[in-house]
Interface confidence: low
């Protein structure tokens, strides 16, 4: 088969800060005279092949664009007809058209511009969950967890921040952990607690606010 062909989704959508895997298969002529290894690169549409670096490549000698370095990864091995692309920490300005290019020295150089990938990075619409184990009882320590189960394990780990205007049992107003350990007091009842999660790889922050319901054990004196 002397045809160059690429099979991949025409369009992929991912929310900013998250990850996406783009399955891709690539086919090229099997010319016996080409002795060099097959290398592949993903490039952004509109760039000059001689002046601009790819966003991801299998060629260890080739530089990649600074904006995508460490975030765009050519997972597949083009020598095995796999051009799968993995994107982590997606950013809004990643939105655009991308195409694959295969090189096999000295004869084969081909850009698959008829099968371009349209990448859409949309606003992060998900919010964290604040998990409270059981009830909050005044005078008893409790662990609150801020959870982002939809986040990508392969992405840059998010940072957590807790904020409250009137949480008397917090020594400081913020903590960098996803778990907040505190001992609520009766006067904390009804106050608001916010967990902010920042995905630094994409520069986006999401938050969840709850109202604390602090109960007293029977027998506890009211002030």
């Amino acid at each position: 088969d002397l045809e160059f062909q690429l099979v991949a989704p025409e369009s992929v959508t991912v929310e900013e800060g998250l990850c996406v895997h783009v399955p891709c298969s690539v086919f090229y002529p099997s010319i016996k005279l080409t002795l060099g290894p097959v290398t592949g690169s993903w490039l952004r549409k509109g760039v000059s092949l001689h002046e601009d670096s790819p966003v991801a490549t299998s060629d260890p000698r080739q530089l990649v664009q600074k904006a995508t370095q460490g975030r765009f990864q050519l997972l597949g091995d083009p020598q095995k007809h796999d051009c799968s692309l993995f994107i982590r920490d997606a950013q809004k300005n990643d939105t655009g058209m991308y195409f694959f290019r295969v090189v096999r020295e000295p004869f084969v150089r081909y850009s698959y511009k008829k099968s371009q990938l349209s990448l859409h990075v949309t606003s992060l619409s998900r919010t964290p969950d604040i998990i409270i184990p059981g009830t909050l009882e005044a005078g008893y320590p409790s662990n609150l967890t801020c959870s982002v189960p939809w986040a990508c394990e392969q992405g840059t780990p998010p940072t957590f921040s807790w904020m409250s205007t009137a949480l008397t049992s917090l020594s400081s107003r913020t903590t960098d952990s996803s778990v907040l350990t505190f001992t609520p007091q009766p006067q904390d009842h009804g106050t608001k607690l916010t967990c902010l999660v920042t995905f630094s790889g994409a520069g986006v922050t999401v938050e969840r606010t709850i109202q604390l319901n602090v109960t007293r054990k029977s027998g506890q004196m009211r002030e």
Partner: nanobody, 120 residues
Framework: EVQLVESGGGLVQPGGSLRLSCAAS???????AAWYRQAPGKQRELVAS???????NYADRVAGRFTISRDNAKNSVYLQMNSLRAEDTAVYYC???????????????WGQGTMVTVSS
């Protein structure tokens, strides 16, 4: 260990509907998900796929009849099959992609398959 549980297959008359489900257990994070099918004596073929962000792709022969969806919180993917035809008879497999690579090769998880028979 990641395990996939598929359900929803069965016998249905032409023109009928079925809903297939595939749930992943074992704590894996699913980025892309897809349904494949394999009819007797034929190669396995892609039916539909869906990305984490919700973009979908369908094989031409099922477009407009089948709908793929997912519940990210439940790590589950579904295939709603309407207006079923005899040629849809096959074993349907779900494939989940955790976005991981082993020795620079993408790693996929496959279900055990569920039989769909369309016959009058």
């Amino acid at each position: 260990e990641v395990q996939l549980v598929e359900s929803g297959g069965g016998l249905v008359q032409p023109g009928g509907s079925l809903r297939l489900s595939c749930a992943a257990s074992g704590g894996t994070f699913v980025i892309n998900a897809a349904w494949y099918r394999q009819a007797p004596g034929k190669q396995r073929e892609l039916v539909a796929s869906i990305s984490y962000g919700g973009s979908t792709n369908y094989a031409d022969r099922v477009a407009g009849r089948f709908t793929i969806s997912r519940d990210n919180a439940k790590n589950s993917v579904y295939l709603q099959m309407n207006s079923l035809r005899a040629e849809d008879t096959a074993v349907y497999y779900c494939r989940l992609d955790p976005g991981l690579a082993l020795n620079n090769r993408p790693l996929y998880y496959w279900g055990q398959g569920t039989m769909v028979t369309v016959s009058s």
